[in-house]
């Protein structure tokens, strides 16, 4: 056991060594390891095959470290692997496409706050198993098309807290079991009418605190299982544009937040909702 | 007569906070029909608006993009009042300052108030 | 964002003269148009909204139509005190958004 941490065998073979101050992986960990702690350190790389020789590895916590680089092939034969969490590292800002190929069991993955500003081409290939994906409180820009595409299993996708401006057609495809979706708190000001064509089971969809003006009720006609929808704190405009929207808020047997118009400025600050269909005048 | 009256400093320092004030007469910050708004003006980028704030039973804020990051404004119900804060500028944010009132029945902005910052070192 | 084109930049006018300053939208924006007056180290003056409504106090001289995306600004006989640079504004969508300006001159 690697002398800044502490090694035992139930419930799971754990190497525990948070908070060590320490500056690099350690050598010597078990090679019987199923669980790894490793948070709250100094450690500001993740070599080329670091754990490679635990090839029972379901728990990976790298979490409040220094990381700044994250070699490609570092988590390698970790085919076992369920919970990665980098979280917490926010000078890392990007992570090579291969880094995490191979890791067909992980069920979750935290990315938040590691100050990425883009998620490369294939970063998430092959990750059938993700059921929860945290990417909050990043700098993404951008979600280019089918980067969640392998992830027909996934039920959380955070991604609030970036500065995402615009929802393309193809950003959430594939996304089939999606339950939850939490675009808050970034600067979308476009959806495109087929973004959330897969979304058949999402349940809840939060898009408060963005730069939405309209939002085209094509985009949320395949939600079919919605139950939860919060549109606050945008800028929405309450003229005849807004009538699709309104329509179909009237309709939703589901839970709303206010929809606040911002213009025109006669109706600024009223739930749309709440307005007659002859207030929405004006094109 | 509704009359705005700016006030703050005239120079400002790059990476620091711009601050500006505005005072409002002969009308209410908490008006329920009326919006406060902050715009500017220069040479080389025009007149821009950068944001406002309103009051309908609670308080509203709208930005403009370009400055979302970077920009509050917040009202001040007993100095009946209304302020602009601006963090971490540049050069670029060399220009007139107004605020402005947008009344309550689609009218564009019919009161100014004018002040001048310049951002320097 | 609407980008709002304003033509022509400058004018040569005289006193007497009838002048149209045009502004079109990127996109439509109804009526939810602006036209204000400035004058060196002062704030613009509104002096029409909704397109065609003249706001309180201006002279009827001055007169605005259009709808869409196509808007004219009209001064029937100009005057000394008209001579200004003269700006649009949509307030149909955010963020909102001003004309380059027209600045009218004396010839």
């Known amino acids: 056991c690697p002398g800044a941490c502490v090694c035992y065998n139930e419930p799971k073979v754990t190497t525990s060594c948070p908070q060590q101050g320490l500056q690099a992986v350690p050598v010597g960990i078990p090679a019987a390891s199923q669980r790894i702690f490793l948070h709250g350190n100094r450690i500001s790389h993740v070599p080329a095959a670091s754990f490679r020789a635990c090839r029972n590895l379901t728990i990976l916590w790298l979490h409040s470290n220094v990381l700044a680089r994250i070699d490609a092939a570092a988590f390698t034969g970790l085919a076992l692997l369920e919970q990665l969490d980098l979280s917490d590292n926010a000078q890392l800002r990007s992570v090579d496409p291969a880094t995490f190929h191979g890791l067909g069991r992980l069920h979750t993955l935290h990315l938040d706050r590691c100050g990425l500003q883009e998620l490369g081409p294939g970063l998430f290939r092959g990750l059938a198993a993700l059921q929860y994906l945290y990417l909050q409180d990043n700098a993404l820009q951008a979600l280019p098309d089918d980067t969640f595409r392998d992830l027909g299993n996934l039920t959380h996708l955070f991604l609030h807290g970036n500065r995402i401006s615009s929802v393309p057609e193809r950003a959430f495809r594939g996304l089939h079991s999606l339950d939850r979706l939490l675009l808050h708190q970034n600067r979308v000001a476009h959806v495109h009418p087929h973004a959330f064509r897969d979304l058949g089971r999402l349940m809840t969809l939060y898009l408060f605190a963005n730069n939405l003006s309209a939002l085209p009720t094509e985009a949320l006609a395949p939600l079919r299982a919605l139950q939860y929808l919060r549109l606050n704190d945008n800028p929405w405009v309450c003229d005849c544009r807004a009538r699709p929207l309104w329509a179909w808020l009237q309709k939703f047997r589901g839970s709303s937040s206010e929809v606040p118009c911002s213009l025109p400025q006669r109706l600024a600050g009223r739930d749309l909702k709440r307005l007659a269909a002859n207030d929405l005048q004006g094109c | 007569q509704v009359q705005l009256q700016q006030s703050g400093p005239g120079l400002v320092k790059p990476s620091q906070t711009l601050s500006l004030t505005c005072a409002i007469s002969g009308d209410s910050v908490s008006s329920n029909s009326a919006a406060w708004n902050w715009i500017r003006q220069s040479p080389s980028r025009g007149l821009e608006w950068l944001g406002r704030t309103y009051y309908r039973s609670q308080w509203h804020n709208d930005f403009a993009p370009f400055v979302q990051s970077r920009i509050a404004v917040n009202p001040d119900t007993s100095k009946n009042q209304f302020s602009l804060h601006l963090k971490f500028v540049t050069s670029e944010d060399t220009a007139v300052y107004y605020c402005a009132r947008d009344p309550p029945d689609d009218q564009g902005f019919d009161i100014w108030g004018r002040t001048m910052v310049t951002v320097s070192s | 964002d609407v980008v709002m084109t304003q033509s022509p930049s400058s004018l040569s006018a005289s006193v007497g003269d009838r002048v149209a300053i045009t502004c079109r939208a990127s996109q439509g924006i109804s009526n939810y148009l602006a036209w204000y007056q400035q004058k060196p180290g002062k704030a613009p003056k509104l002096l029409i909204y909704?397109?065609?409504t003249l706001e309180s106090g201006v002279p009827s001289r001055f007169s605005g139509s259009g709808s869409g995306t196509e808007f004219t600004l009209t001064i029937s006989s100009l005057q000394p005190d008209d001579f200004a640079t003269y700006y649009c504004?949509?307030?149909?969508?955010?963020?909102?958004?001003f004309g380059g300006g027209t600045k009218l001159e004396i010839k």
């Open positions: 504004q949509q307030y149909s969508n955010y963020p909102l958004t």
């Open positions: 909704k397109a065609s």
